[in-house]
C-alpha cells in the first residue's frame, strides 16, 4: 500500500519519523527538491526533543531545515503552524540581513554550528535534512 511502515535504507528512525542527513551541500530549493523526490520534506522541527536529535546527527555544521519566508511570513514546508510552534532562533535572528552583498535579504532557515537557527541567503550550498513520517499515507508536499 501507500503507507510507510519502516524507514528506507540509510535513513534514521526516530519517534515515528525517518530522517536522512546529507553529506554534501545544495541551495535550499535544490535540497527541498531532493527531499520531495524522496517522498519526504526538509526537516520540520516541532519540539526541543526533535531539535536535540537532529542537532546530534548534524554536528556543528550549517544545515538547511524546512522553514522559509520567501513569500512573506515564515512557513514550515509541511504546513505546521509557525507562530504557535517550536522555535530555536539565535539571539536577534531572524534579521533578514541585506549586508551580505548577494542581493535581497535572508529567507531560508538553517541550523548553525551550535544548533540554534539563523536565516540566510537561500542560495548558499548547505547540507540539509529530509524527514518523512511513518504510518502516513503518501501526500504530495504543498507547493511553495
Amino acid at each position: 500500500g501507500s503507507e510507510r511502515t519502516c524507514c528506507p535504507v540509510n535513513w534514521v528512525e526516530h519517534e515515528r519519523s525517518c530522517y536522512w542527513f546529507s553529506r554534501s551541500g545544495k541551495a535550499w530549493a535544490d535540497a527541498d527538491n531532493y527531499c520531495r523526490l524522496e517522498d519526504a520534506h526538509l526537516v520540520v522541527v516541532t519540539s526541543w526533543e526533535e531539535q536535540k536529535f537532529v542537532q546530534h546527527h548534524i554536528g556543528p555544521v550549517n544545515t538547511w531545515m524546512g522553514l522559509h519566508d520567501q513569500n512573506g511570513p515564515w512557513k514550515w514546508v509541511d504546513g505546521t503552524d509557525y507562530e504557535t510552534g517550536f522555535k530555536n532562533w539565535r539571539p536577534e535572528q531572524p534579521d533578514d540581513w541585506y549586508g551580505h552583498g548577494l542581493g535581497g535579504g535572508e529567507d531560508c532557515a538553517h541550523f548553525t554550528d551550535d544548533g540554534r537557527w539563523n536565516d540566510d541567503v537561500c542560495q548558499r550550498p548547505y547540507r540539509w535534512v529530509c524527514e518523512t513520517e511513518l504510518d502516513k499515507a503518501s501526500q504530495e508536499p504543498p507547493l511553495l
Epitope: P8, S24, K26, Y34, R36, L37, E38, D39, S138, P141
Partner: antibody
Framework: EVQLLESGGDLVQPGGSLRLSCAAS????????MTWVRQAPGKGLEWVSA????????FYADSVRGRFTISRDNSKNTLFLQMNSLRAEDTAVYYC?????????????WGQGTLVTVSS | DIQMTQSPSSVSASVGDRVTITCRAS??????LAWYQQKPGRAPKLLIY???SLQSGVPSRFSGSGSGTDFTLTISSLQPEDFATYYC?????????FGQGTKVEIK
C-alpha cells in the same frame, strides 16, 4: 538482477501522442525515484523528467513541460511517459533510468531505449 | 540552466595511454557530478558519481576529481573496451544537464 525494459516507441506525426512504458524488475521499484533521459540521433543526452518513488513529486525539462507527463504504477512495477503535442525535435531514443543514491540524482541502471520518431 | 562544457570533443589515443577529459560547469555544482560511458547503440553506463566516487563494478583505472565548476575524468591506462563516448552530468540544480560528450577514438 536489475532490469529495465522500455516499449511504446513508434513513428508518429507532429502533433500526435505516444505513451512509453518501462517495465522494471530486480529491485524495490516503489522505493526508487525514476527518470526519463532522451538522446536525439547522433546527439548527446538530455534529461527529460523525474518522479519520486510514490509518484507524488514530478519534475520536467522546460522543453517538454506541459506536453509530457511522467507517472508510475507501483503495483505493476512500471514507469510511463505520456507524450502529447509531439514535435520533430522530440525525435530521440528514450531511456528510463533508475536512481542510484536518492533524489533522482544519478542513474545506475538504464533500459535499452525505445525510439520515438516524429515525422510527417 | 547550468551549462556543462566538455573538452576535448574528441581525443585519439592508444591502448595504454593516460586519457584526461575535463568538464566545466557554468556555475558551481559542488560535487554533484557524474561521468557516464556510452558505446554505439547502447545505453550509458555510470562510471563516477559525487565527482570522485567509483561506481560498483567499474575498473579502478577510471577516476574522477574536481569540485565547484571544474571536473576531470581520468583513464589511467586505456584499454580496448574503453573506446567510447563519455558524458558528464550535473545533479546540483534542476534541470539536470549533460555535457556534449567526448569521443575517445583509437589512434
Amino acid at each position: 538482477e536489475v532490469q529495465l525494459l522500455e516499449s511504446g516507441g513508434d513513428l508518429v506525426q507532429p502533433g500526435g501522442s505516444l505513451r512509453l512504458s518501462c517495465a522494471a524488475s530486480g529491485f524495490t521499484f516503489s522505493s526508487c525515484a525514476m527518470t526519463w533521459v532522451r538522446q536525439a540521433p547522433g546527439k548527446g543526452l538530455e534529461w527529460v523528467s523525474a518522479i519520486s518513488g510514490r509518484g507524488g513529486t514530478t519534475f520536467y525539462a522546460d522543453s517538454v513541460r506541459g506536453r509530457f507527463t511522467i507517472s508510475r504504477d507501483n503495483s505493476k512495477n512500471t514507469l510511463f511517459l505520456q507524450m502529447n503535442s509531439l514535435r520533430a525535435e522530440d525525435t530521440a531514443v528514450y531511456y528510463c533510468a533508475k536512481d542510484l543514491i536518492g533524489g533522482a540524482t544519478y542513474f545506475d541502471y538504464w533500459g535499452q531505449g525505445t525510439l520515438v520518431t516524429v515525422s510527417s | 540552466d547550468i551549462q556543462m562544457t566538455q573538452s576535448p570533443s574528441s581525443v585519439s589515443a592508444s591502448v595504454g595511454d593516460r586519457v584526461t577529459i575535463t568538464c566545466r560547469a557554468s556555475q558551481g555544482v559542488n560535487d554533484w557530478l557524474a561521468w557516464y560511458q556510452q558505446k554505439p547503440g547502447r545505453a550509458p553506463k555510470l562510471l563516477i558519481y559525487d565527482a570522485s566516487s567509483l561506481q560498483s563494478g567499474v575498473p579502478s583505472r577510471f577516476s574522477g576529481s574536481g569540485s565547484g565548476t571544474d571536473f576531470t575524468l581520468t583513464i589511467s591506462s586505456l584499454q580496448p573496451e574503453d573506446f567510447a563516448t563519455y558524458y558528464c552530468q550535473q545533479a546540483n540544480s534542476f534541470p539536470w544537464t549533460f555535457g556534449q560528450g567526448t569521443k575517445v577514438e583509437i589512434k
